[in-house]
Each structure stands twice: as C-alpha cells, then as structure tokens.
C-alpha cells in the first residue's frame, strides 16, 4: 500500500494513527470519528489541550495514546464523551498534573503518565493512591515529580477530601412545616458544593441558599412522603469528592389495612401499616389479645428503602376450627392510633361430624420445599376417609 | 438443608444454670421459621421447653417459664436457652429443632446435673 | 387439661396394620403432629398438620383424627418401625406446646 500522506492515516479496521511531526493543534474533525476505537498520536508539539469538545463524537473510542506531544492540560471532562476508555496513554507529555475528575466515571485498565514534569501536589494524590493499590499499571512507572523525588514519597497528611457537616433539626418535623437544612464544608481548596436532591419529587417545596461554606435547604410544606428520601450535600476539592446523606422524619400517625386470608403454603392475613415514627403492632382475635406462637405469628415482608408503609401477614400454619374468627390489628404510635378487622374462616370443624352429614370440603395441601418454612411434603395417592383430619 | 448442633456444657452442678446453643445452618434463622428446645430425661418421653421467632418472640412451657430463658443472635445465626436453678430432674438429652413442625432436630446433647 | 395420653406400648405383626392413639382434649382444637424415634437417635417428623407427611416418608404411615383421639396408622408394618412414637400438639389455650408419653412399637 502506497504511504499516507495525511496528517492521520487509518490503521486497522478501526483505528487512527497520527504521526506527521506538528501536523495536529487539536483533534477537531477526525476523519472516520464515529467508528474508531483505537488512537494513536505522537510527535504533536502543538497538541496542547485536550478538552471536552475534542473527543465529541468519539463514544466508541477504548485506547488513546498521545506521546512525545505537547500536551499541557487535560480538562476535568475531556473523557465525558469516551465512556468506554479503558487504555490512556499520556507518556511524555508536558503533564504537571491531572485532575481526578478526568478519569472519574472511566473503568480504565491502563494509565500511562511516565514522561511528564508532574507537580506533586494535592492534586495528585489520587493517582498517589492509585499508585499504592496498584491501579491502573502506575506502581510500574515509578512516577516521579519534577525535582521533587517519587510520586510515592509525596507527603499526603493535610490531602484530605471536604469534610461535610450536616445539621438536621433536632425537633419533631410534622406534615406542613418548613425544614432548614444547613451543610457545613471544611477543607482546603473548595471548589464546588451543593445539594443532590433527585429522591424529593414532590415531598416538598425546594429552596436553596448560601453557598461555600455554608449552603443552605429549605423544604417548605414537607408531606410525608419526605421519610426515608436521601438528601445529600456534596463538595468538590483538588483531591476529591464528598458526599453526606441525611434524612428528615416527617412524623405522622399510625395507620392501618387488612386484606381478606389467602392461603398460600400457609394462611396469610396481609396487612399494612405505616406511619412515623413506626407504630407498635397489636392482635386481637375475636377481641382479645392474640399471643404469637410459631402456629400463629406476624411475618413482615422485606421493607423497600425508601418508603415507610411495612407489609406483611399474620401467618398461620394450618389453622383449623378453633382460628375462626374476627382477627383485629391494632397500630400506635405518639402521633395516633388504627386498628383494622376483618373476619377469616379456615375450616368447620374437622374433628367432629355426623357420619349422615355431606362430606367437607378439605383445603387441599400445597407441595411446599423446606427452604419456606415447611417441611416437604409427600402427597397422598390414596383418597383418605372423611374422618382423616390429623397428622 | 437446614442443620441444627447443640453446644455447651455436659455437667452443671445442681443450683447453677445449665447453658446450650444451638447453630443453624443450611438456612438463615431469620427466615419465617420460629425454633424450639425440647428435652428428653433418660428413658423417658420428650418434653417441649420453649420457642423463639427471629424478632424476639418467645414462649415457654409453664411449668418451666420462671427458670427458662430462650434467645436468639441473627449475627451467629443461633439462638440459646438458659435454664436456672437446675436440679437431678433436668438431666436430659436436650434438642433443639425448627418449629413449629420440628421437621429438623438438632443429634441432641446429654446435660448432667451432678455435684 | 394440657395432657395427650398414649398407650405405653403397642406390638404388630410384620406386614399387618397397626394403629397408634393420642388422646387429649387440645385434639379437638389442633391438629397433631407424629414423631418417631429410634434409640440413641433425634425424634423424625413422620406426620403433620392435616395428614401431611414429610418426603422421605413412606405412604403407609398416615394420620387421622375423631373428637379428642389422633391416631397414626402404620399399613404394612416393617421391621424398621420398631420405635417410639410420640403425638404433640398445640395445648387448648393455643399459647404452648405438649407432647403424648410416647407409644413404643414392636414388630414381631
């Protein structure tokens, strides 16, 4: 094949190979962007920035190589439109550092930095960390920083990400009120913070004020809805991110509903509660006080994070006769109290009837396995009597 | 498949508390199942001592209630009865097992009340 | 009364059928569950809840009940039901649990 005359010629299927000395100033306008996977520049001395606008369009691009170039700065989001990123080579360079932002949001297998004038500073103590976990292929570069000795020598005590404070009121919150939430940040270097409020919806009314450091939350007219809802502050220095959750009790009163008895491998009365703080649960059977035995029992379903209503059941292992009745549940707590009846028949009598009287109808047995709870049946091929009710 | 083992001392002297656990494993004691001891005194019949549910629920055969304490650690994934005040009368084979079937039992563990 | 009453001792001839009782008066109210045990060996669940048997179980074990009498049937016997058998159940007031005396089998 006949040599490429271009400032970038093709290589491979999908790549770009980009070799002519001072050919390049900026990567607008590739040919072929779309496609390529692998790129590959060297010599490019006027090649110094590389930022967000540059790699747009790249989005199937998983090696960079840029060497023995000029290349200054690299942009906190230069890689935000190259996800798939897994090898970056930015050996000889004129590098004195990298922001950790620009390699966040990457799964990189391969960081080449060896080469470059690196500063040792703040800054780079996250590739200082990645240095003494072995990320990334930089333990074998044995970085070093311009007149300074090794990257892993770099003092690293006062390096710390924002430290986030985050005062909640101490008070009860109830339904309607306005909420002030504070966020105090520490830390050197502070370059951005703010609050993370995607959970909220409509849980309440949003005003933001204040800025570093000290950002301010208004949620006015909170419903209860706001409970188990994450409300984060976060904060952005040289070495890092910081992120606090909290979470506001909205308080509001117990209550309570009772859906008709299924059988499943057991008798299950649903149920749900919900109010906050959680109420107390009580039963009442036939309106006395209903003592939970491994026969009978409360049985919660796993609760979901972010919402305060629990499920469950009253659950009942193979209830005759004598669990017929009006089931009650009771719920409280500081804020109110609800109760909820219903009425459950499991069998008539199968103990006791009159030979002359239509055979009953038996619920028939469920094949169960023992990781439920109930031992493994074997079912029966042989119809049994009227009178067979035990066992 | 669930496993049950009984643990803990095989002599106590009278007037002490006897001490057993039971490990679960195969299962999660957490799960919808409450668990159980019984107790079987040489050549004798078994008797039921107590049952427990993961959230603390417990219930005791009266005729033990004052002297049994039956608990449960998640983190173990075993529970554990206490029995005060022991006399000849609580030697016994003790089991523990899954209730309320008792479709899984513990090999059983001999529990001496000896001075 | 928080009692199931067993007789002591039952004896069947190899293949015949023999029927085992639990009396109490917490039997008209629960169902009773059947263990049968071995020397030297943990009680085995052989019947349960409304006539339900564990796997593993053979069907010529099988439970039945009338008033305040549980019985476990045993049709065929083999030699390998020689054993003590024990009935439990529910006590009246629901809140504990009671077991019979026990019923030892002997197969001739």
């Known amino acids: 094949a006949a040599p490429c005359p271009d400032a970038c010629c093709p290589h491979g299927s999908s790549g770009l190979r980009c070799t002519r000395d001072g050919a390049l100033d900026s990567l607008h306008h590739l040919p072929g962007a779309e496609n390529l996977t692998e790129l590959y520049i060297e010599n490019q001395q006027h090649l110094q920035h590389l930022e967000l606008r540059d790699l747009r369009g790249l989005g199937e691009l998983r090696n960079l190589t840029i060497v023995k170039s000029g290349l200054r700065f690299v942009a906190p989001d230069a890689f935000h439109f190259t996800p798939r990123l897994s090898r970056l080579n930015l050996s000889f360079n004129a590098l004195e550092s990298l922001s950790w932002k620009t390699v966040q949001g990457l799964s990189l297998q391969e960081l080449v930095l060896s080469g470059n004038p690196l500063h040792c500073s703040c800054a780079l103590r996250w590739l200082q960390r990645w240095e003494e976990e072995g990320l990334g292929g930089v333990p074998e570069q044995k970085l070093q920083c311009h007149g300074q000795g090794p990257l892993a020598h770099m003092p690293n005590a006062s390096c710390g990400v924002p430290t986030l404070k985050v005062q909640v009121p101490n008070a009860s919150v109830d339904v309607g009120d306005d909420v002030l939430l504070r966020c105090q940040v520490e830390g050197r270097g502070l370059e951005q913070a703010g609050w993370i409020l995607t959970e909220l919806e409509q849980s309440a009314t949003v005003m933001k004020s204040g800025g570093l450091p000290s950002l301010g939350l208004t949620l006015a007219n909170v419903t209860s809805d706001l409970n188990r809802k994450n409300v984060t502050c976060w904060a952005e220095n040289d070495v890092g991110r910081a992120e606090v959750s909290v979470q506001v009790n909205v308080s509001f009163p117990a209550s309570v509903q009772l859906h008709t008895a299924v059988e499943m491998h057991h008798w299950c009365i649903p149920f749900s509660v919900d109010g906050q703080p959680a109420p107390s649960l009580r039963w009442l059977f036939n309106g006395s006080v209903l003592n939970e035995t491994s026969f009978i029992f409360t049985e919660f379903l796993e609760p979901a994070a972010n919402e305060t209503v629990r499920h469950g059941c009253l659950r009942l292992n193979q209830p005759t006769h004598v669990n017929n009745g009006n089931y009650t549940l009771l719920a409280a707590n500081p804020f109110g109290q609800a109760s909820a009846s219903i009425m459950a028949a499991f069998m008539d009598n199968p103990f006791e009837f009159n030979p002359e009287d239509p055979i009953p109808v038996s619920f028939s047995p469920v094949d169960t396995n023992s990781t439920s709870g109930d031992p493994v049946e074997k079912k029966d091929e042989t119809p049994f009597g009227v009178s067979v009710a035990v066992g | 498949e669930v496993q049950l083992q009984e643990s803990g001392p095989g002599l106590v002297k009278p007037s002490g508390t006897l001490s057993l656990t039971c490990a679960v494993s195969g299962g999660s004691i957490s799960s919808s199942n409450w668990w159980t001891w019984v107790r079987q005194p040489p050549g004798k019949g078994l008797e039921w001592i107590g049952e427990?549910?993961?959230?603390?629920?417990?219930n005791y055969n009266p005729s033990l209630k004052s002297r049994v304490t039956i608990s449960v650690d998640k983190s173990k994934n075993q529970f554990s009865l206490k029995l005060s005040s022991v006399t000849a009368a609580d030697t016994a084979v003790y089991y523990c097992?899954?209730?309320?079937?008792?479709?899984?039992w513990g090999q059983g563990t001999l529990v001496t009340v000896s001075s | 009364s928080s009692e199931l009453t067993q007789d002591p001792a039952v004896s069947v001839a190899l293949g015949q059928t023999v029927r085992i009782t639990c009396q109490g008066a917490?039997?008209?109210?629960?169902?009773a569950s059947w263990y049968q045990q071995k020397p030297g060996q943990a009680p085995v669940l052989v019947i349960y809840?409304?006539?339900k048997r564990p796997s593993g179980i053979p069907d010529r074990f099988s439970g039945s009940s009338s008033g305040n009498t549980a019985s476990l049937t045993i049709t065929g016997a083999q030699a390998e039901d020689e054993a003590d058998y024990y009935c439990n159940s529910q006590a009246s007031s629901g809140n504990h649990l009671i077991f019979g005396g026990g019923t030892k089998l002997t197969v001739l």
């Open positions: 097992a899954r209730a309320p079937w008792f479709d899984y």
């Open positions: 809840g409304k006539n």
């Open positions: 427990i549910y993961h959230r603390g629920n417990r």
């Open positions: 917490s039997l008209r109210s629960y169902y």
